[in-house]
């Protein structure tokens, strides 16, 4: 809290700039005028203001709007949004984007801050829904902005929005989310041609069902290990020694090198050995001829 | 309700083959979905996997015991075993069974676990 | 082999704490990565499977979250009964590993 003093005689600010970094804290909460810093924010971003001097400021525009600050404000806060907290941020209602821009440049190149996540929650939730136009500036800015999302936020991405995501944007996805996602994709890109319906819908698969992994085998699309490793083992496990060889392509030979890892491992151990042979890869750990295979989809929703 | 039991000599003299056996009970254990898993844990210690069997017979071992351990599957009995040569005092361990699911690759239901010493 | 290292070894909490316990893996295991509780003299039970998902009859104050390499167990107000050793285990690739364990003792 900086004390109330008077303001010394001729110091008085008729508008913001550079002379200001001259005065002191308390010269500042004296001899300018809150109003005054209201109507000219644009010109604090360009002044080197010192973190103490920022403070005082921050100090007058609470005292001017207790309840929040308004847009007109809040688009031109620059560096001074560094010094607000989340719960500062609640009280706002930011609802251009051109303003969610403004402030997520001043963090540009960090981590996401708690700040930050505030005020994307809050302009989330003033629009509704993940609009495209948002999630394209969002994910510009934190490429993992849509995987720290919960799979019940996720949920209200329109499939239209879809458009606007970047494999990277992915890459930290868990299953549950992908879940979530690739019905959306599926639905987005549902009227594409064959090749480049698997190009955008490649990185969703992590969410797909086997009957979607069974009819993508049949299109030619030589899916590579690496998405291959990120299907869900549930999905995996059902198809066949053929299905898998078509799904792969000629990418099937590296199999081998992943048959200690999921989900290779556990489809391995699901397929006739004498299935697995036909592939020439060496793969081991499948069932012996004169093993009875089990409905294992039915002995597993029994147990 | 599925339920694993441990069974076995709690004494192994060194150099010899400490054998256990892992019971199921509440359920088969030709059940496709899992894997039927042993884990040891040294007094004081963290947990170590030794290996995996699958109803068809296939196994996985840890490499740092493979050349000594054996796992087998008896599904008549609705059992299986593990086999663990040339035991040292280092293999001093509460041996515990467990399931493991494949969908989930989680250890979801454990045997209340043996104490094995190796002393002479 | 893949490598899982839990930090802290070991800590000291008040009932109503926020706890957290992290895991890395020596390389991805994308979410295969779970969570156990052991408590002195019994087995292992299971937490979180998945990274994120929740074990049927685990109360909602556990949570996990994670994936690649670097994961977390949070336990968001901790109770009496919650004072136990927490291992975090991959089941991506064989040897399937465990972190070395996190003791959680009352402050």
């Known amino acids: 809290e900086v004390e109330k003093t008077a303001c010394p005689s001729g110091k008085k600010a008729r508008e913001i700039d550079e002379s200001l970094i001259f005065y002191k804290k308390w010269e500042l909460e004296a001899c300018v005028d809150a109003a005054l810093l209201a109507t000219q924010m644009d010109r604090v971003n360009a002044i080197p203001f010192t973190y103490e001097q920022l403070d005082v400021l921050k100090h007058k525009l609470d005292e001017l709007y207790p309840q929040g600050y308004p847009e007109s404000v809040i688009q031109h806060l620059g560096y001074l949004f560094l010094k607000m907290s989340p719960e500062d941020i609640r009280k706002w209602n930011v609802t251009s984007l051109e303003t969610l821009k403004a402030l997520l440049e001043v963090n540009k190149g960090h981590e996401m801050s708690p700040q930050v996540a505030t005020l994307i929650d809050r302009f989330v939730k003033g629009r509704g829904q993940l609009d495209k136009d948002t999630l394209d500036t969002l994910t510009a800015f934190y490429p993992g902005y849509l995987c720290s999302l919960s799979p019940e936020e996720l949920s209200s991405v329109p499939p239209s929005s879809i458009w606007a995501v970047r494999p990277q944007d992915l890459d930290t996805c868990d299953p549950r989310q992908l879940d979530v996602l690739y019905p959306k994709a599926r639905l987005a890109f549902q009227n594409m041609n064959g090749s480049e319906y698997f190009v955008k819908i490649q990185s969703f698969l992590g969410g797909a069902p086997t009957e979607d992994l069974k009819a993508l085998s049949q299109q030619n699309v030589s899916m590579d290990l690496a998405t291959f490793m990120k299907l869900r083992t549930d999905a995996v496990l059902p198809l066949t020694v053929a299905e898998v060889q078509k799904l792969l392509g000629p990418h099937v030979e590296g199999l081998k090198a992943e048959e200690r890892h999921r989900p290779v491992r556990d489809w391995i151990l699901r397929q006739r050995q004498d299935d697995l042979d036909t592939l020439g890869l060496g793969l081991q750990g499948g069932i012996p001829n004169g093993y009875l295979v089990l409905d294992l989809s039915m002995q597993e929703a029994l147990s | 309700q599925v339920q694993l039991q441990e069974s076995g000599p709690g004494l192994v003299k060194p150099s010899q083959t400490l054998s256990l056996t892992c019971t199921v009970s509440?359920?088969?254990?030709?059940?496709?979905?899992?894997?039927w898993s042993w884990i040891r844990q040294p007094p004081g210690k963290g947990l170590e996997w030794i290996g995996y069997?699958?109803?068809?017979?296939?196994?996985y071992y840890n490499p740092s015991l493979k050349s000594r351990v054996t796992i087998s599957v008896d599904t008549s009995k609705n059992q299986f075993s593990l086999k663990l040569s040339s035991v040292t005092a280092a293999d001093t361990a509460v041996y515990y069974c467990?399931?493991?699911?494949?969908?989930?690759?989680?250890?979801?239901?454990w045997g209340q676990g043996t104490m094995v010493t190796v002393s002479s | 082999d893949i490598q899982m290292t839990q930090s802290p070894s070991s800590l000291s909490a008040s009932v109503g704490d926020r706890v957290t316990i992290t895991c890395r893996a020596s390389?991805?295991?994308?979410?295969?990565l779970n969570w156990y509780q052991q408590k002195p003299g019994k087995a292992p039970k299971l937490l979180i499977y998945?990274?994120?998902s929740l074990q049927s009859g685990v109360p909602s104050r556990f949570s996990g979250s994670g994936s690649g390499t670097d994961f977390t167990l949070t336990i968001s107000s901790l109770q009496p009964e919650d004072f136990a050793t927490y291992y975090c285990?991959?089941?991506?690739?064989?040897?399937?590993?465990f972190g070395g364990g996190t003791k959680v003792e009352i402050k």
């Open positions: 467990a399931r493991e699911s494949t969908g989930t690759g989680a250890f979801d239901i």
């Open positions: 509440g359920g088969s254990i030709s059940s496709g979905g899992y894997y």
């Open positions: 069997i699958y109803y068809s017979g296939s196994t």
């Open positions: 390389q991805s295991i994308s979410s295969y």
């Open positions: 998945a990274a994120s």
């Open positions: 285990q991959q089941s991506y690739s064989t040897p399937l590993t």
